[in-house]
């Protein structure tokens, strides 16, 4: 996170820290008990494009709450992972829920709509380009999508697309993404902070969901937007996945 | 009562027979586990005048049910009794209530308006003039009060009233009872029959209401109509001496 | 009015521990209701639960008990209604 | 979320009889709930009666038991919320 | 407001040339590609390309390419295309239309113009 | 070239009716789909597109749903100003192409 609040009170207890077997830092999403989602970018992280779940798990290594280590018993991938960028990952126990560790919710309406402010907490890197000692948040608006698309791809028209990322990466996007804005503060999610969730504060219901998971974490207030994966359109495929594990 | 229908599958549990000590059979109605309404005219029979409350309970026998005897504790006679002609009955124990053996509720508005028909029950003469075996019931019409007092009294004006009564006896006729009628069946209350209630069935609650006890027992089809004090104009009476006893 | 012969009185050496589940607790109350041909009096509910000092209380009327009182004007077997 | 520790669980020897009301019954009952950052998932509401065989039965699931989940969405303290 | 002027109704001979003028005001003139769009009558639509303004690059329906030149004079705010060796096919209404680079819709048509050839 | 289909050429309907005019593409076009409405007197406008999406100004009556191949166009309460032609255009794959159009008609 690049700017934005030091997290002092444990206000995102659904942020868990996942680190690679060469040690690099990246986000994950506790939504129950047992399972977390991630970004399939970061499940893949110093892993050929040819490893399997199964590889990967062993790999991996997992924080949840006060740097609590917890373990991982599967992975699974969304079966449309090059453009739905999310994996799933099942821990061996149950986490014990406490004021430190809280999963977030899943939406039953998409509240991603231009303007509405979300909070994305991570361990990503910071403006020393460090990863973060202390989990940090930034508020972000949900970008209008078509202004997103051009920013990055030139054109909303298939035929004129041409790759125009301002940081030499482009990021998936398609009909399962939305898209965040840097604040007017040039705060912004920055490397390592990818995984993390969008998180919207429903005011009536006094609740937290998961709006989207942040899976383009490389904009560092060069590019102008973050790209999330919309939760609503994976949210099938997770309630599926968990019953059948 | 004289026609009617015999009581074959106990629908008046709150009826009760009392015998006084030279062997009159008269009616009374329970109204609580341990409480019974009767008039004073029956507590007085074969009493002077001057016969206190604690002269008359010792010398009356009370069944419930099936001829369940009870014990009484003590009478109360009305403060009024010479116009408001009632008496309550507090017995020595409460009676268990079964499907024999029940109260009937005491109205909380009244019910007494012309042509509402009510259940009366009795233990008293019938067409041959003698006291019955069986509990008999008979369903009679409330009538028109003005009528009633034409029909005693010959007026509703007090200087043109004069016993008119065609049974030679003249009923107390005030703002406290309410007169019902003979049906066409020449069906009717007689001797005996005084202290049982006129039963109104709510159908909206599905419960049965003592509107009235029956005071003038002596129309037994010569005259149009018995006579019954209203237990709307004694229930705050009731619930007080209940209250203190 | 349900008799209460198909419920079994606790018998004197309690009741059944019921089963524990993960991350809960158990709360014990026993309903106060009354046999056939009586109704339940009270300005409570008629439920009682256990406190601290395993006395059996009500929330609105403490450790006071409600009543079994008569029904009144329900025969059984009512008279036939009125043609 | 309430925690469970203001109410004593049954000791082993199960609890203390309810005091016995003129022609009434005690139904004994039981509600589970769950600890702080836990929520009942039941289809029933969690109530439990003691049936004839002395088994505890909830009238809309039996003898199936609720489980306790975790409660989602509720941090204890949130972010201050967006000016 | 946005506008786009066409020229007026054209009868030309087969074999002829004919240029066709789309005029725009109301907007930043460069930022937007123009298209151009033919409707013969009593029939559907058919696309023949697009041009845009600010660096003049062009795309073609391969059913058109050689026979139709789209250019701009960004001095007048005007495009134009030239339809070549026409033949009695081509009579019909050529609607000239801007793309908002809304996944590819046109927003603002012109009002068309009639070539008659015969 | 993907083949626009609007397999309605005609359509009647009474003032107030739902009315639902469909488009089919010869392969999946993502959902870049636009509809367009010519009145009597040549003049187009742009009404949806991107499937669903209502152009601005665009009355809320008209609305657009569709993906794959099978797209459609609705419009909820029909007045009589809706009476003109009605075009579907794809635009995932050059050269864009157009349906036929559906004319549509009072009772």
């Known amino acids: 996170i690049l700017g934005g609040h030091l997290d002092a009170k444990g206000s995102f207890p659904w942020q868990a820290k996942m680190v690679s077997h060469h040690n690099l830092t990246t986000g994950a999403t506790l939504i129950n008990e047992q399972w977390l989602l991630t970004t399939a970018k970061n499940l893949f992280l110093n892993h050929s494009e040819n490893a399997t779940a199964k590889d990967i798990a062993p790999t991996l290594t997992l924080y949840v709450g006060k740097k609590q280590l917890v373990e991982i018993e599967k992975v699974v991938l969304h079966p449309n992972y090059s453009q739905v960028d999310i994996g799933l990952i099942k821990l061996k126990q149950k986490v014990s829920v406490n004021e430190r560790v809280m999963p977030i919710c899943l939406p039953s309406k998409d509240y991603a709509e231009v303007g509405r402010v979300g909070y994305v907490s991570g361990w990503g890197r910071n403006a020393n380009f460090k990863f973060t000692d202390h989990l940090k948040y930034v508020m972000l608006p949900v970008a209008d999508q078509d202004q997103c698309i051009r920013h990055y791809e030139g054109s909303t028209v298939p035929e004129k697309k041409t790759p125009k990322s301002p940081v030499g990466v482009q990021p998936i996007l398609n009909e399962h993404t939305f898209c965040a804005g840097m604040s007017k503060y040039q705060e912004d999610t920055c490397y390592g902070d990818a995984g993390s969730a969008f998180a919207v504060h429903d005011l009536e219901e006094d609740t937290w969901y998961a709006t989207g998971i942040l899976s383009f974490d490389k904009s560092c207030a060069v590019a102008e937007y973050g790209v999330y994966v919309k939760v609503t359109s994976i949210q099938d495929w997770v309630q599926k996945t968990i019953a059948e594990n | 009562i004289l026609g009617g229908h015999l009581d074959a599958k106990g629908s008046f549990p709150w009826q009760a027979k009392m015998v006084s000590h030279h062997n009159l059979t008269t009616g009374a109605t329970l109204i609580n586990e341990q409480w019974l309404l009767t008039t004073a005219k029956n507590l007085f029979l074969n009493h002077s005048e001057n016969a206190t409350a604690k002269d008359i309970a010792p010398t009356l026998t009370l069944y419930v049910g099936k001829k369940q005897l009870v014990e009484i504790e003590k009478v109360v006679l009305h403060p009024n009794y010479s116009q408001v002609d009632i008496g309550l009955i507090k017995l020595k124990q409460k009676v268990s209530v079964n499907e024999r053996v029940m109260p009937i509720c005491l109205p909380s508005k009244d019910y007494a308006e012309v042509g509402r028909v009510g259940y009366v029950s009795g233990w008293g003469r019938n067409a041959n003039f003698k006291f019955t075996d069986h509990l008999k019931y008979v369903m009679l019409p409330v009538a028109d009060q003005d009528q009633c007092i034409r029909h005693y009294e010959g007026s509703t004006v007090p200087e043109k009233k004069t016993p008119k009564s065609p049974v030679g006896v003249q009923p107390i006729l005030n703002e406290h009872t309410f007169c019902a009628g003979m049906s066409k069946y020449q069906e009717d209350t007689c001797y005996g029959d005084a202290g049982s209630a006129f039963a109104v069935h709510d159908l909206e609650e599905d419960t049965w209401y003592a509107t009235g006890i029956l005071s003038f027992d002596k129309s037994c089809a010569v005259a149009e109509y018995g006579v019954y004090v209203k237990v709307t104009s004694i229930q705050d009476w009731v619930q007080k001496t209940i209250a203190e006893n | 009015v349900d008799s209460g012969n198909d419920v079994t009185d606790i018998a004197d050496d309690g009741c059944p521990k019921p089963p524990e589940i993960a991350h809960g607790y158990v709360e014990h109350s026993v309903r106060y209701q009354c046999k056939n041909y009586y109704k339940l009096r009270t300005e409570g509910d008629g439920v009682y639960t256990l406190n601290n000092e395993k006395q059996w209380i009500n929330k609105a009327v403490g450790d006071k008990l409600p009543e079994c009182e008569a029904v009144c004007g329900k025969p059984k077997n009512p008279a036939n209604p009125v043609q | 979320v309430d925690s469970g520790n203001d109410v004593t669980d049954i000791a082993d020897d199960g609890c203390p009889k309810p005091p016995e009301i003129a022609h009434g019954y005690v139904e004994h009952s039981v509600r589970y709930q769950c600890k702080n950052y836990y929520k009942l998932r039941t289809e029933g509401d969690g109530v439990y009666t003691l049936n004839n065989e002395k088994q505890w039965i909830n009238k809309a699931v039996g003898d199936k038991l609720p489980e306790c989940e975790a409660v989602c969405g509720k941090p204890k303290n949130p972010a201050n919320p967006v000016q | 407001q946005v506008q786009l002027q066409q020229s007026g109704p054209e009868l030309v001979k087969p074999g002829a040339s004919v240029k066709l003028s789309c005029k725009a005001s109301?907007?930043?003139?460069?930022?937007?590609?123009i298209n151009w769009v033919k409707q013969r009558p009593g029939q559907g639509l058919e696309w023949i390309g697009w041009?845009?303004?600010?660096?003049?690059?062009?795309k073609y329906n391969a059913n058109f390419k050689g026979r139709a030149t789209l250019t701009v004079d960004t001095s007048s705010s005007t495009v134009y295309m030239e339809i070549h060796s026409l033949t009695s096919e081509d009579s019909a209404v050529y609607f000239c239309?801007?793309?908002?680079?809304?996944?590819?819709?046109?927003?603002?048509w012109g009002q068309g113009t009639t070539l008659t050839v015969s | 070239d993907i083949q626009m289909t609007q397999t309605t050429s005609s359509l009647s309907a009474s003032l107030g009716d739902r009315v639902t005019i469909s488009c089919r593409a010869s392969?999946?076009?993502?959902?870049?789909l636009n509809w367009y409405q010519q009145k009597p007197d040549g003049t187009v406008k742009l009404l949806i597109y991107?499937?669903?999406r209502l152009y601005s100004a665009v009355p809320s009556r008209f609305s657009g749903s569709g993906s794959g191949t099978d797209y459609s166009l609705t419009i909820s309460n029909l007045e009589q100003e809706d009476i003109a032609m009605y075009f579907c255009?794809?635009?995932?794959?050059?050269?864009?192409?157009f349906g036929g159009g559906t004319k549509l008609e009072i009772k």
């Open positions: 041009i845009y303004p600010r660096d003049g690059s062009t």
């Open positions: 991107y499937t669903s």
């Open positions: 255009q794809q635009s995932d794959r050059l050269p864009y192409t």
């Open positions: 392969q999946d076009i993502r959902k870049y």
């Open positions: 109301g907007y930043t003139f460069i930022s937007y590609d």
């Open positions: 239309a801007r793309d908002p680079d809304y996944y590819g819709s046109v927003d603002y």
